[in-house]
């Protein structure tokens, strides 16, 4: 004969555990039903009655099967430097991620605690490693024969154009100027953007113009090309 199916609440056999989506209530000493995602325990079970569940109120959620007395509060609204990538529902918390042009400088369990603007490499420097959702741009000095004349978080160092006759030699921050009407060939056709980065952890020691980085949020820096612009918190 098949074993009789026990309905909650029930007393578990000694040494056994409650089934999936059930929990052991210490007070009632019974296996009782959990509440489904989007609900919470309104009334805990007793020896004779099962858990009573109720829907989460607005701006609260439960993501897992649970027996919590109250749903969790959704995080605060996303700040101005963030976008909401997951809305607050009864079953999931709001998730805020950094908006385009920014990266997450300090993450939290889900989403981002501190967003900061991507570093812009100044003229003479190009992007060595592009920014990602969670890492800043890395800049490097333009090597001989290349240049960058922009302040940009995407432009790499580009080769100088090759001239029949050079009027002004190029340098790290300026392209070569040719005297002839057109160069032999142009190696630098407009702004070049780096492809998506390879996320590797490197330990450069840059004897040649290798990358190196500097902050990219402009907030507490009192002077000049404000490095970091202070990011905002997404709590």
């Amino acid at each position: 004969l098949p074993a009789q199916v026990a309905f909650t609440p029930y007393a578990p056999e000694p040494g056994s555990t409650c089934r999936l989506r059930e929990y052991y209530d210490q007070t009632a000493q019974m296996c009782c039903s959990k509440c489904s995602p989007g609900q919470h325990a309104k009334v805990f079970c007793t020896k004779t009655s099962d858990t009573v569940c109720d829907s989460c109120e607005d701006s609260t959620y439960t993501q897992l099967w649970n027996w919590v007395p109250e749903c969790l509060s959704c995080g605060s609204r996303c700040s101005s430097d963030q976008v909401e990538t997951q809305a607050c529902t009864r079953e999931q918390n709001r998730i805020c991620t950094c908006r385009p042009g920014w990266y997450c400088a300090l993450s939290k369990q889900e989403g981002c605690r501190l967003c900061a603007p991507l570093r812009k490499c100044r003229p003479g420097f190009g992007v060595a490693r592009p920014g990602t959702e969670t890492s800043d741009v890395v800049c490097k000095p333009c090597a001989p024969g290349t240049f960058s004349n922009t302040t940009s978080s995407t432009d790499i160092c580009r080769p100088h154009q090759i001239c029949n006759v050079v009027a002004i030699p190029g340098n790290a921050s300026m392209d070569a100027v040719c005297t002839s009407t057109s160069p032999t060939r142009s190696m630098a056709p407009g702004a070049v953007h780096l492809p998506q980065p390879v996320s590797t952890r490197s330990q450069h020691t840059q004897p040649t113009p290798e990358p190196s980085t500097a902050p990219s949020t402009s907030f507490l820096l009192p002077m000049g090309p404000s490095p970091p612009a202070e990011g905002s918190t997404g709590d």
Epitope: A105, R119, R122, S135, S212, A214
Partner: antibody, heavy 121, light 107 residues
Framework: EVQLVESGGGLVQPGGSLRLSCAAS????????LSWVRQAPGKGLEWVAY????????YYSDTVKGRFTISRDNAKNTLYLQMNSLRAEDTAVYYC??????????????WGQGTLVTVSS | DIQMTQSPSSLSASVGDRVTITCRTS??????LPWYQQKPGKAPKLLIY???KLAEGVPSRFSGSGSGTDYTLTISSLQPEDFATYYC?????????FGQGTKVEIK
Amino acid sequence: EVQLVESGGGLVQPGGSLRLSCAASGFAFSTYDLSWVRQAPGKGLEWVAYINNGGISTYYSDTVKGRFTISRDNAKNTLYLQMNSLRAEDTAVYYCVRGPFYGSANYFDYWGQGTLVTVSS
Amino acid sequence: DIQMTQSPSSLSASVGDRVTITCRTSESIYSNLPWYQQKPGKAPKLLIYDATKLAEGVPSRFSGSGSGTDYTLTISSLQPEDFATYYCQHFWVTPWTFGQGTKVEIK
């Protein structure tokens, strides 16, 4: 107010190790690049090591490469310098400095008070 | 490595004097040059960055000039609190070297 406070200096024998720490406050630590600069007694300044804001890029001076390791813990707002195989010529005051925001803002804008490392037998 | 040649190594001057310190690099550093002031027993302090820009809170008697390989720090009218050691530094390719320093002493 931006503050950088170094600790961990002291007397160590040649060949020994030391770990310096720098506790930072008053700014969004995880968005800034940081460096260590040292100054031997009565001598000039020498840049030692650099780490970018995310800890992905590190650079070292040739004099310490392979012996020193710079690291950071953005959750603890702390910068570190692990110094191994120490030599007499590493004796100096070690400064924790903010910057450069390399490629964008190229300067050291805040300095700690320094911690003295003495390598001697 | 880029060599930094700072001169003079020391100078004696009086309050009110105009003081000029020069820094020459072995190759162009594209104005990626700050100047620092250091007083005995203290950490250095940023004075000038990008060769010509005055850092926050620094008196206007300090000024920087230059480009390419030649840079100058000028103190237009030396004050008692300006007696210190001054360093230039480059931020082009690593290693980021400092000049040897210029000690400004009271005449």
